[in-house]
């Protein structure tokens, strides 16, 4: 499904396309276009992928670009104002809405742009704790590629006063090379905490070939979240976890 | 501070159509879905169903040629209706914010929650 | 649909007890998982959402915690006011279900 509508609403109910009016060909001036995309229902997310062939005015996105925000509406959180020839990265919502701004000015036309909405799928469940005093955690399919569009929560738990060291044996995502305005791993990447995910302190966030070397955690609870984008899979990661313990009253579950 | 006040007939005979009314006061309205739970006597908790301040509906799969949630912005209020009863739907309706946004991004949990009201269904 | 498991159903503590409920999910939902406190002839309370985070004014004696199909509930040291039943809720997929109820009652 295709529309090329100046704004719409849309409730998903199989992945489409929405594009700027007249996209491949010279968008309109003085053209404002919104689209509501909506999830069925409060548990989906929605992801968006901007086709490569991504052309607007590029004059610090004074003139013409495209917005994203992540809610109902401009008050939804605010996720990237775009303009050039770079297109730019996936965008997954929060929630079940995302409100998409094009908005061109009188002069100075480009080719537009296109974009691919879809549920923001999990793939397959990949999801794991860990209790034993050592293990071995591998990204999906290892060391096939990788699937799409995951995110995966791994969760190392030990007793307290017992230190987990988490050494990567074979490291490869999808390279971020040139990254805007500081951030970094933006397609695929493992953010590491010690603790639990967004609650503990935040270890690192990788991807690339570079391996994160050997992790260190003292909490009793080492995290790791992989996320995958919709696109360019690569083999993922294998790694090794052990446990020093500190106090050996406590016993593994 | 977020409070929902529910209120409905408490007594119905089978066949009949249950019909309540959860009113919200404080907050935002637009922001969240808004939904219906039951609890039957001394059982566990049953999402019905939840709605949008535009309208858009989700039901329970379980109920949903039953239940109808509608919705008036205008009051930030929103009703159930769940058709042609039986005595198994003898229970306490609670109305409750469910997922929506706030501060800190899109949230998944039912908070807070109306008071609840005792439907019988009896003949 | 989603089926939440709880254990145990009744568990019998005193005051100062360290609680713990567990709660299982028949397929992964990530983290997210919530846990409610409801007393009789009151509507459910929310403790816990996201699996680990504290709710603003519930006391920090309550902790949650996992990810994926296995979560617990704990209550580090009882305290008279906890005498209730607790729920878990999965808010990872519709429709949202909850868990069959842990009753924890006086030893």
């Known amino acids: 499904f295709r529309n090329d509508k100046c704004g719409d609403t849309i409730k998903i109910e199989s992945p489409g396309y929405l594009t700027s009016p007249g996209y491949p060909h010279s968008y309109h001036p003085s053209e404002k276009c919104e689209w509501l995309i909506q999830a069925p229902d409060p548990y989906q997310r929605i992801m968006i992928n901007f086709n490569p062939h991504f052309d607007l005015e590029d004059r610090d996105c004074k003139y013409d670009y495209v917005e994203v925000f992540d809610g109902e509406n401009e008050n939804g959180h605010f996720r990237g104002k775009f303009c050039g020839k770079i297109a730019p990265p996936p965008v997954v919502s929060s929630g079940p809405f995302l409100f998409i701004k094009f908005v061109s000015d009188y002069e100075t036309h480009g080719a537009g742009f296109s974009i691919r909405y879809e549920i923001f799928k999990r793939g397959p469940e990949c999801s794991q704790n860990y209790t034993t005093p050592s293990g071995v955690i591998k990204s999906p399919g290892f060391p096939e590629k990788y699937p799409n569009s995951l995110e995966c929560t791994y969760i190392v738990f030990v007793p307290k006063m017992s230190e987990i060291i988490l050494e990567f044996e074979s490291f490869d995502l999808e390279p971020d090379s040139n990254p805007p305005g500081g951030m970094f791993c933006r397609y695929d990447r493992l953010e590491i905490w010690d603790g639990f995910p967004d609650v503990g302190p935040h270890i690192g966030r990788y991807c690339g070939q570079k391996t994160p070397g050997r992790i260190r955690s003292s909490s009793g609870i080492l995290s790791m979240v992989f996320y995958t984008d919709s696109a360019i899979a690569k083999e993922g990661f294998s790694a090794n976890y052990s446990v020093l313990q500190s106090s050996v009253s406590e016993d593994f579950k | 501070q977020v409070q929902l006040q529910q209120w409905g007939a408490g007594l119905l005979k089978p066949s009949e159509t249950l019909s309540l009314t959860c009113a919200v006061y404080?907050?935002?309205?637009?922001?969240?879905?808004w939904s219906w739970i039951r609890q039957p006597p001394g059982k566990g908790l049953e999402w019905i169903g939840d709605?949008?301040?535009?309208?858009?509906?989700n039901y329970n799969p379980s109920l949903k040629s039953r239940v109808t949630i509608s919705v008036d912005t205008s009051k930030n209020q929103f009703s159930l209706k769940l058709s042609s009863v039986t005595a198994a739907d003898t229970a306490v309706y609670y109305c409750?914010?469910?997922?929506?946004?706030?501060?800190?991004?899109?949230?998944?949990?039912?908070?807070?929650w109306g008071q609840g009201t005792l439907v019988t269904v009896s003949s | 649909d989603i089926q939440m498991t709880q254990s145990p159903s009744t568990l019998s503590a005193s005051v100062g007890d360290r609680v713990t409920i567990t709660c299982r999910a028949s397929?992964?939902?990530?983290?997210?998982l919530a846990w409610y406190q409801q007393k009789p002839g009151k509507a459910p309370k929310l403790l816990i959402y996201?699996?680990?985070s504290l709710e603003s004014g519930v006391p920090s004696r309550f902790s949650g915690s996992g990810s994926g199909t296995e979560f617990t509930l704990t209550i580090s040291s009882l305290q008279p006011d906890d005498f209730a039943t607790y729920y878990c809720?999965?808010?990872?997929?519709?429709?949202?279900?909850f868990g069959g109820g842990t009753k924890v009652e006086i030893k």
């Open positions: 409750a914010r469910g997922p929506g946004y706030d501060s800190s991004g899109y949230s998944r949990r039912f908070d807070p």
């Open positions: 397929q992964s939902i990530s983290s997210w």
């Open positions: 809720q999965q808010l990872n997929s519709y429709p949202p279900t």
């Open positions: 709605i949008w301040h535009s309208g858009m509906t």
């Open positions: 996201k699996a680990s």
């Open positions: 404080g907050g935002s309205f637009v922001k969240y879905y």
